[in-house]
């Protein structure tokens, strides 16, 4: 069944920690359907963003930081590993340096740590995609 | 209650028409959340389209024509009538030379037509939106 | 080990620019994602910040220094160069250039050796 | 004027735990970098990411954060630790922002 969107859920991450997301575009790549994935230090949607990562499917996938409401140098990719019309498994792991993005199994993007990933306190998943998971994985201690 | 999104209708407009949607941002400004509004040829989504009215609210709005599956010179408005968090109405109407869009019943935004308004057979409206009215109104003959 | 080389002039004239360069050894400016810095301490003082310049060759500056600030790159010599225009006694200083792999906010883990510059006429 | 401030002087006993701290950064949105400076050398970096420490420093020197507090801890100091030290965060990632320093001293 689908989950609403957008989905926001409470988050607690640090190394270790791996957020999985699976979907799928509610439009074809021709019209540029978008999906973003925004890691927030509140509950509130207007907070700042750690990690905000979003995809304008079939084009290209943009990476920044929103900073006391400002936003950062954003870091552009072409990599596109989306498949047009196509079911996607997105997981994003916290390594000690960096975040890690998989699709589909294959990493894919990386984006440096501006900030501590234990910030965090919540992870929205939004634009147009329909949802069918999320999970957030802690390591165990 | 609220409308399936993405949204799309059959359609036939000619000068006179007006198309009215009612509908809220799912997202405050800051974050940046778009609406848009595409007259296509063809009922299917991948078709050309007479008419692109792409709100990235807060920021700016985009219109263009999508020809052969190219786009085509974008047009671009800061004009900014949408308010932050609140509901609002928009009607797009047909005049004999171009489109006349109005927000919350002012005149914001005018597109020359580039293709005839006959040619329209659909018109979808998404992305980051909820959606409460969508109707189609034809003109006496 | 990568190594890095400040040179440039000791004595600079004031309202004149400084312009210092910094040569790369055992690593390039251009890998991913190494941030690429000038950091100044005046004679008894403590480190200032002034600006970078990052893997890519987008620029950061210190906002009480940016108007005066300019931080570029000579790829194929793997340089970056400072300079600072209109400079007065008060930026008499060692320059050191240094490496953040991670992000201007986060550590430097090398530096050169600095060079000291003395703004007298 | 910095936006993090360290005390000017601290001074510990052989042998003994010295702290030295920085206050007024945001340290639980940016990491803390420590840096340890002797005269006519250029500064080493002894502690990054609050707590973690570059090889080839010694298991004495430690760092913590909490709020707007880091704190770099040099259990069983030595003579040769006597030096100028420095601690680095961000006001915003696109920046560097450097406390004034603090001179260590071994009585």
């Known amino acids: 069944s689908l989950l609403p969107v957008p989905y926001t859920e409470a988050a607690s991450l640090s190394t270790g920690s791996t957020v999985t997301i699976k979907g799928r575009p509610l439009a074809c790549f021709l019209n540029e359907p978008y999906l973003q994935v925004d890691f927030h230090t509140e509950m509130k949607e207007e907070s700042d963003i750690v990690f905000h990562f979003q995809v304008c499917f079939g084009r290209r996938v943009v990476m920044n930081s929103r900073e006391y409401g400002a936003w950062k140098q954003q870091v552009e990719s072409k990599n596109m590993p989306f498949q047009d019309g196509q079911e996607f498994e997105l997981s994003i792991s916290v390594l000690p340096d960096k975040y890690q993005v998989m699709v589909n199994g294959q990493s894919s993007y990386t984006f440096d740590h501006r900030i501590k990933p234990e910030a965090v306190k919540m992870v929205q998943v939004w634009r147009d995609i329909s949802l069918t998971k999320f999970n957030v994985s802690y390591l165990k201690r | 209650s609220l409308l399936p999104v993405p949204y799309t209708e059959a359609a036939s407009l000619s000068t006179g028409s007006t198309v009215t949607i009612k509908g809220r941002p799912l997202a405050c400004f800051l974050n940046e959340p778009y609406l848009q509004v595409d007259f296509h040829t063809e009922m299917k989504e991948e078709s050309d389209i007479v008419f692109h009215f792409q709100v990235c609210f807060g920021r700016r709005v985009v219109m263009n024509s999508r020809e052969y599956g190219a786009w085509k010179q974008q047009v671009e408005s800061k004009n900014m009538p949408f308010q932050d968090g609140q509901e609002f109405e928009l009607s797009i109407s047909v005049l004999p030379d171009k489109y006349q869009v109005m927000v919350n019943g002012q005149s914001s935004y005018t597109f020359d037509h580039r293709i005839k308004p006959e040619a329209v057979k659909m018109v979808q409206v998404w992305r980051d939106i909820s959606l409460t009215k969508f109707n189609v109104s034809y003109l006496k003959r | 080990q990568v190594q890095l080389q400040e040179s440039g002039p000791g004595l600079v004239k004031p309202s004149q620019t400084l312009s210092l360069t910094c040569t790369v050894s055992?690593?390039?400016?251009?890998?991913?994602?190494?941030?690429w810095s000038w950091i100044r301490q005046p004679p008894g003082k403590g480190l200032e910040w002034m600006g970078a310049?990052?893997?890519?060759?987008?620029?950061y500056y210190s906002p009480s220094l940016k108007s005066r600030t300019s931080i570029s790159r000579d790829t194929s010599k793997n340089q970056f160069t400072l300079q600072l225009s209109s400079v007065t006694p008060e930026d008499t200083a060692v320059y050191y250039c240094?490496?953040?792999?991670?992000?201007?906010?986060?550590?430097?883990?090398?530096w050169g050796q600095g060079t000291q510059v003395t703004v007298s006429s | 004027h910095s936006a993090v401030t360290q005390p000017s002087a601290v001074s510990v006993s052989l042998g003994q735990t010295a702290r030295i701290t920085c206050q007024g950064g945001?340290?639980?949105?940016?990491?803390a970098s420590w840096y340890q400076q002797k005269p006519g050398q250029a500064p080493v970096l002894v502690i990054y990411?609050?707590?973690e420490r570059p090889s080839g420093i010694p298991e004495r020197f430690s760092g913590s954060s909490s709020g707007d507090t880091a704190t770099l801890s040099i259990s069983g100091a030595q003579a040769e630790d006597e030096a100028d030290y420095f601690c680095q965060s961000g006001r915003s990632s696109d920046n560097a922002v450097f406390g004034g320093g603090t001179h260590l001293t071994v009585l």
């Open positions: 055992g690593g390039s400016i251009t890998t991913n994602y190494y941030y």
């Open positions: 945001k340290f639980g949105r940016y990491y």
């Open positions: 240094a490496r953040a792999p991670y992000g201007i906010s986060r550590e430097y883990d090398y």
């Open positions: 310049i990052a893997y890519s060759g987008s620029t």
């Open positions: 990411k609050d707590s």
